[in-house]
């Protein structure tokens, strides 16, 4: 018997593009470039679980979904990998799973999701607020992530049978309507930049929670739903962080772990830290205030309980390292 | 040892929908996904799609995009494949099967396979 | 999509014989390949999974071996009731089949 997370309404970002662009009529060019550029983005899905028969378990499930061979999966808590995050664990396709308690058990559970299983009291207990991220690095996508966390009402006794998440996909009807939709979007959006191309470029703020500036895109809405994919990294409860997570799990302690850096557990710094070359920008985001915006992918964002979905707010990253290249 | 035991034989007329279930026993059904593959009569082997039950999340093949619904029901342990639009090429024997795994590194396997459910598509 | 091509399509050997089959993928796929034997109106059974790794209760006759894009099933001594169609499956990107090879008695 468990208790799933439930995913708050899904609102798109509030502040209009308008203020970036300065330009009102600039505006619908800009979304349909969007809906151009961002078809078939790949997404991530989390579900967090915590377990009736263990208070103090959790079960975190995520996967991807897109058409990239996968290269490495972090799991962290307490935001996104990188932003802040702790990371949980790290599992590599091939070389093996690293996990930093309280996670007692990560593992591939299918060939594109993994799961973990989270415990513990005391100081590094998770708690009903705890937000949880996962993040997949794929090639030749890059990098996506997504959060997800229990509300803080979640009652463990409940008898409630877990409700099944909405399968994701696009019927025959949506694809034509988007295909519909993009081609005349891009078709009108040339125009529209032929005509004013004696305007000034409008200037997108690279989003500060990334060393890169990457390419703009902005929130694009699905046909399938007024939601957008995007909620904003939930504030945690600071109390329910593990005080330390020096104690490393590997399984079979393959060699390729002798590389992670010494406090990966508490400055988790993603699969660039193993990388011997450069990572390219590849960016996905408008950042308007430092504000994290997703952008709508190709697939309806049918979310439900214990699902969110939304991709990296710092844009995919090749894997060109080691651990990227099979 | 799961056993997957999968609904008889059917036959359609072109246009129509087809719904096939497959029932697992003797394991673990809801974190393991279940794969859906067909074989039309003296031809290959074609994977349509996936679901993992206890998250309910389906993968499809691009081919069948918008023609193919898997769904899959926890407390009955039972999957299902849904295929619309029916035409005579859709004649063949549909497969389920466990998408299994040691759970340390991402290889996966089908094993076990259902016995295979006939749809015969005819006007 | 990762295609996967397999040769031969079909051939006749003898019990005894040494049969290799060879499966390429349009793309790296690493080691994530995995090799079915199926007979006529049977379910496919799993021979080797992760390109090399024998299945438990396969007999040690059956090999698989290569990475990458090539790949290779090796009966070493042609048994009677080895005679069925072999495919090989990706499962790096979803999953894609091989077209299959037919191994039929010369």
């Known amino acids: 018997m468990r208790t799933e997370a439930q995913v708050p309404a899904l609102q798109p970002p509030e502040p209009g593009l308008e203020g970036a662009m300065g330009h009102r009529t600039l505006v619908l060019p800009w979304v349909l470039l969007t809906l151009c550029v961002t078809a078939g983005t790949p997404e991530v899905w989390v579900q967090v679980r915590m377990e009736a028969t263990e208070l103090s378990s959790f079960t975190i499930r995520c996967g991807f979904l897109g058409s990239g061979s996968i290269s490495l999966v972090t799991v962290s808590w307490g935001g996104p990998n990188g932003a802040g995050g702790t990371t949980l664990a790290v599992l590599h396709p091939e070389r093996g799973i690293r996990q930093w308690a309280p996670a007692r058990q990560a593992r591939w559970e299918t060939q594109s999701s993994i799961s973990l299983i989270l415990e513990g009291s005391g100081a590094s207990s998770p708690c009903a607020n705890t937000t949880f991220c996962c993040k997949f690095a794929s090639f030749p996508e890059g990098s996506w992530e997504a959060c997800g966390s229990l509300p803080p009402s979640s009652d463990p006794g409940l008898s409630a049978p877990p409700t099944p998440a909405p399968i994701l996909r696009a019927d025959l009807a949506g694809i034509l309507g988007v295909s519909g939709v993009l081609l005349f979007g891009c078709v009108y959006l040339l125009h529209l930049l032929r005509r004013h191309k004696h305007r000034p470029a409008p200037r997108l703020q690279p989003s500060r929670t990334s060393p890169q500036a990457p390419r703009a895109r902005a929130w694009a809405p699905s046909q399938a739903s007024q939601a957008a994919l995007h909620v904003p990294y939930a504030t945690i409860n600071t109390s329910c962080r593990p005080a330390t997570l020096d104690t490393a799990h590997p399984h079979g302690g393959p060699s390729w772990w002798a590389s992670l850096p010494t406090h990966a557990a508490h400055r988790p710094q993603g699969p660039a830290a193993w990388a011997s070359t450069p990572i390219p920008a590849r960016g996905s985001f408008v950042s308007v205030e430092n504000g994290l915006y997703a952008q709508a992918g190709e697939r309806p964002p049918h979310t439900g309980p214990g699902l969110t979905l939304f991709p990296d707010p710092r844009g995919p990253r090749a894997m060109e390292g080691p651990l990227g290249v099979r | 040892q799961v056993q997957l035991v999968q609904s008889g034989a059917e036959v359609k007329k072109p246009g129509s929908s087809v719904k096939v279930s497959c029932k697992a026993s003797?394991?673990?059904?809801?974190?393991?996904?279940i794969s859906w593959v067909r074989q039309a009569p003296g031809q290959g082997l074609e994977w349509m799609g996936n679901?993992?039950?206890?998250?309910?999340?389906?993968n499809y093949a691009q081919k069948f995009q918008g023609r193919v619904t898997i769904t899959a029901d926890e407390s009955t342990s039972t999957a299902y494949m849904e295929l619309s639009s029916l035409r005579s090429e859709d004649t063949a024997v549909y497969y389920c099967?466990?998408?299994?795994?040691?759970?340390?590194?991402?290889?996966?396997?089908?094993?076990?396979w259902g016995q295979g459910t006939l749809v015969t598509v005819s006007s | 999509d990762i295609q996967m091509t397999q040769s031969p399509s079909s051939l006749s050997a003898s019990v005894g014989d040494r049969v290799t089959i060879t499966c390429r993928a349009s793309?790296?796929?690493?080691?994530?390949l995995n090799w079915y034997q199926q007979k006529p109106g049977k379910a496919p059974k799993l021979l080797i999974y992760?390109?090399?790794s024998l299945q438990s209760g396969v007999p040690s006759r059956f090999s698989g071996s290569g990475s990458g894009t090539d790949f290779t099933l090796t009966i070493s001594s042609l048994q009677p009731e080895d005679f069925a169609t072999y495919y090989c499956?990706?499962?790096?990107?979803?999953?894609?089949f091989g077209g299959g090879t037919k191994v039929e008695i010369k």
């Open positions: 992760a390109a090399s």
């Open positions: 003797g394991g673990t059904f809801s974190s393991a996904a």
């Open positions: 793309q790296s796929i690493s080691s994530y």
């Open positions: 499956q990706q499962s790096d990107i979803l999953y894609t």
């Open positions: 099967a466990r998408d299994t795994g040691r759970g340390y590194t991402r290889h996966f396997w089908f094993d076990p």
């Open positions: 679901i993992i039950p206890i998250v309910g999340i389906a």
